[in-house]
């Protein structure tokens, strides 16, 4: 008894096609081994016609394929343009030779039933409608008009002009005449199914003077479109169902062994497996819509169907479109964490991959929202201003050429938890999904800025310090000035990191920023952060308000993206050799973007270097103080 299973008998008609599904036991070996379809000869030998290794015999060239569906433990042999010569005994099987596990299938291809010479052929897709034209002579104008469907013995009424309708056609069949033309009647049948296919006769009048016309209606199932996508990439199903279903609810479902399970529909249903990574977008009034799925997984491979019906569920006799999605595990898209965890008040730095060949593409970050059909409003982008509600706490750092850009979100709250997408205006396959989880903070943040309520006085000197733990001793520290176009890193240099010492004083690891003299444009958000090369780490944010000496606090306003930056170590002597041009905030440079700035850092303010007990968070003993430039207005 073979563990392979399939149809024992298959019968079809010349010119038609068959799709033979063979089922195999669920084992890893079976999923990966060769699948074949062979024809049995009189000698008992079985000659391969097609196999999953890519072999295709001459007689099947251009008219057959074999597709393995490992997720369903099936493989399918599709054969088109059948002829009577295809009648015979076959085997579908598994194994390196045709003597492996197999199942016997008998295929019988019959001649097309002879159609009367005046037969009119209508070819329609499943779910669509057909209008059959039935001409008649004037003398039969007052007589009964009818359409019947031929069965083996008789012709079964579909509809007639006395409003008699076969139960199978109620609500689907209409008999009508157009205008004043009394020589033709029409029958429209909607929501066509496979079962409507066949021979029909339309008739006007009775007896020998009756007008008759033969009609052959062919109802075709849509051929699945094959889609090949990489693991972790995205796929868009473009569904075009036609104007007649423009106002119906739309759905995308995935066929499993038993049914077609709805993944998403326009009535708000969504499969939890696709949470955070799916959108359905109505395109226009012509019944067109698309479904986008990001972060493709191995288990997403399979047979998908889109359709339209008021229930938002698959319904026979309604138009559909189908796809076979293959997910290639050898992906060009790097394997990144799909879940990022943060704590309230803290920050996250999310590395977004993009196609390295498209380094000049525009980069975006959006938040997936599941309400309605799902949407992903852009929160930040290389040429998109940060959304107002994210003021001061969201920035995108582009790192041209290395295939990654970074999005930093700080001042986290539990409401920030959810799904976010990385996307560009280039290669759409590189859309990726990140789930952000935010837990309640249980300890102090790693980076702390003092003073916390920062109000600078116009014209005076103002210093803020960013305290960091010893575990960050080897990382680059930076300050940047936030604007709704990004966070422009201010020229800075951490002198302490290059010094040899035997201790790391937890209390005195700091990088400071001095504004001297304070101007109105200095008001706004500033970030203190750490990074290692192109990898960004934690950040913290502070809003610096600027007020006049004689007045109370001024209104909090975001500042100009090109505000001049002045950064200094506390009480560091002024180095006025840096020109204003060099000190403009450069869009997204590294902390050491300007060689001149590194060279101009002196070895001053020795007294600020910390020395204390040995020991640090990461087992290194090192003292570091930060030296920075300070610029005069």
């Amino acid at each position: 008894k073979s563990p392979i299973f399939g149809p024992q008998e298959v019968s079809s008609i010349e010119g038609d096609s068959v799709s033979i599904t063979c089922y195999y036991p669920d084992t890893s070996v079976n999923r990966h081994t060769r699948k074949y379809w062979c024809r049995q000869g009189a000698s008992g030998m079985c000659t391969t016609l097609i196999s999953s290794n890519g072999y295709l015999s001459k007689e099947y060239s251009g008219r057959a394929n074999l597709i393995n569906f490992p997720e369903n433990n099936t493989f399918v042999i599709n054969i088109e343009q059948l002829t009577q010569d295809d009648t015979g005994s076959y085997k579908c099987g598994l194994g390196t030779s045709n003597r492996g596990l197999s199942f016997d299938v008998s295929l019988e291809v019959s001649q097309v039933p002879e159609l009367p010479s005046d037969t009119h052929v209508y070819t329609k897709d499943i779910g669509r409608n057909v209008t059959i034209e039935c001409p008649f002579k004037r003398e039969n104008a007052p007589s009964k008009k009818s359409l019947c469907k031929k069965t083996n013995q008789s012709c079964e009424l579909v509809i007639d002009s006395t409003e008699k309708v076969n139960p199978s056609y109620i609500g689907r069949a209409k008999l009508f005449m157009k205008g004043t033309d009394l020589t033709v009647f029409y029958v429209n049948i909607s929501h066509l199914t496979h079962n409507d296919a066949g021979l029909y006769i339309c008739q006007a009048g009775e007896g020998p003077s009756a007008d008759k016309k033969n009609v052959d209606l062919q109802v075709l199932a849509p051929e699945p479109e094959l889609l090949y996508k990489d693991l972790r990439s995205s796929v868009t199903f473009e569904c075009d169902l036609g104007r007649e279903v423009a106002n119906e609810a739309k759905y995308l479902c995935r066929m499993n062994k038993e049914t077609c399970d709805v993944i998403i529909n326009t009535l708000g249903k969504r499969d939890p497996d696709f949470e955070g990574r799916i959108l359905i977008t109505p395109k226009d009034d012509n019944g067109r819509f698309s479904v986008l799925i990001t972060g493709l997984r191995k288990e997403d491979a399979g047979h998908y169907q889109c359709g339209a019906h008021s229930s938002g569920l698959p319904q026979e006799g309604w138009p559909i479109q189908t796809w076979q999605l293959f997910v290639n595990e050898e992906s060009t898209i790097p394997n990144r964490r799909s879940v990022v965890k943060g704590v309230t008040g803290g920050s996250v730095a999310i590395a977004c991959p993009y196609n390295p060949k498209e380094s000049s593409s525009l980069k975006y970050w959006c938040r997936w929202e599941g309400d309605g059909n799902g949407h992903c409003p852009v929160l930040v982008g290389t040429q998109a201003q940060v959304q107002e509600e994210y003021e001061g706490r969201l920035a995108l750092f582009d790192q041209p050429g290395n295939g990654t850009y970074t999005v930093i979100l700080n001042q986290l709250t539990t409401e920030d938890a959810g799904f976010y997408w990385c996307l560009t205006n280039g290669d759409s396959r590189w859309r990726t999904t990140i789930e952000l989880q935010v837990a309640e903070a249980t300890r102090e943040p790693n980076l702390e800025v003092t003073p916390q309520n920062a109000t600078a006085v116009l014209g005076e000197t103002f210093t803020v310090s960013c305290h960091y733990p010893c575990k960050f001793y080897s990382q680059e520290k930076y300050w940047c000035k936030w604007s709704n176009k990004g966070c422009h890193i201010l020229p800075s240099h951490d002198e302490g990191a290059r010094q040899s010492s035997v201790s790391c004083d937890q209390s005195s690891q700091l990088v400071s920023m001095t504004l001297n003299p304070v101007s109105k444009e200095d008001e706004g958000w500033y970030w203190c952060g750490v990074k290692q090369g192109q990898t960004y780490g934690e950040t913290t944010a502070i809003y610096i308000a600027v007020e006049e000496r004689t007045r109370g606090s001024s209104h909090v306003n975001p500042t100009d993206a090109n505000a001049r930056a002045k950064v200094a170590l506390e009480e560091e002597v002024v180095d006025s050799s840096i020109s204003e041009k060099e000190n403009k905030a450069i869009p997204n440079p590294g902390p050491f973007a300007n060689e001149r700035e590194i060279q101009n850092v002196g070895d001053q303010a020795q007294e600020n270097r910390a020395s204390g007990d040995a020991g640090s968070a990461d087992g290194q003993s090192r003292s570091s103080s930060s030296k920075h430039h300070h610029h005069h207005h």
Epitope: E9, V10, I13, D16, S19, M255, H303, E316
Partner: nanobody
Framework: EVQLVESGGGVVQAEDSLRLSCAAS????????MGWFRQAPGKEREFVAA??????????YYADSVKGRFTVSGDNAKKTLDLQMKDLKPEDTAVYYC??????????????????WGQGTQVTVSS
């Protein structure tokens, strides 16, 4: 209301023949797959035979235990299903159920591949 009604069951001698029929009414579609299952006392429901229609092609499936003895046939448009049983054996004794599904996919041997079920008809084969 959807109804699948089986008929033709009865008591026969071993090696006799019997023909079961199933008529569907109230189905919102002409089925694309219909099948026969059976359940003997104290046993699981098991697949017997099925027929599937797609376009002008027909696909027939049989359980190993009935191959060569049972023949399934049906009319997709009329929503009828027949099972011609020959050379019956005592182990064929069971309640035979008719099942239908609007779609032509899913493993026909699994009961989950069918949406609608009949009440069953008893077949008893005495030795």
């Amino acid at each position: 209301e959807v109804q699948l009604v089986e008929s033709g069951g009865g008591v026969v001698q071993a090696e006799d023949s019997l023909r079961l029929s199933c008529a569907a009414s109230g189905l919102p579609f002409s089925s694309s797959r219909m099948g026969w299952f059976r359940q003997a006392p104290g046993k699981e429901r098991e697949f017997v035979a099925a027929i599937g229609w797609s376009g002008r092609s027909t696909y027939k499936y049989y359980a190993d235990s009935v191959k060569g003895r049972f023949t399934v046939s049906g009319d997709n448009a009329k929503k009828t299903l027949d099972l011609q049983m020959k050379d019956l054996k005592p182990e064929d004794t069971a309640v035979y159920y008719c099942a239908a599904h609007p779609d032509y996919y899913g493993d026909p041997r699994t009961s989950g591949a069918y949406r609608y079920w009949g009440q069953g008809t008893q077949v008893t084969v005495s030795s």
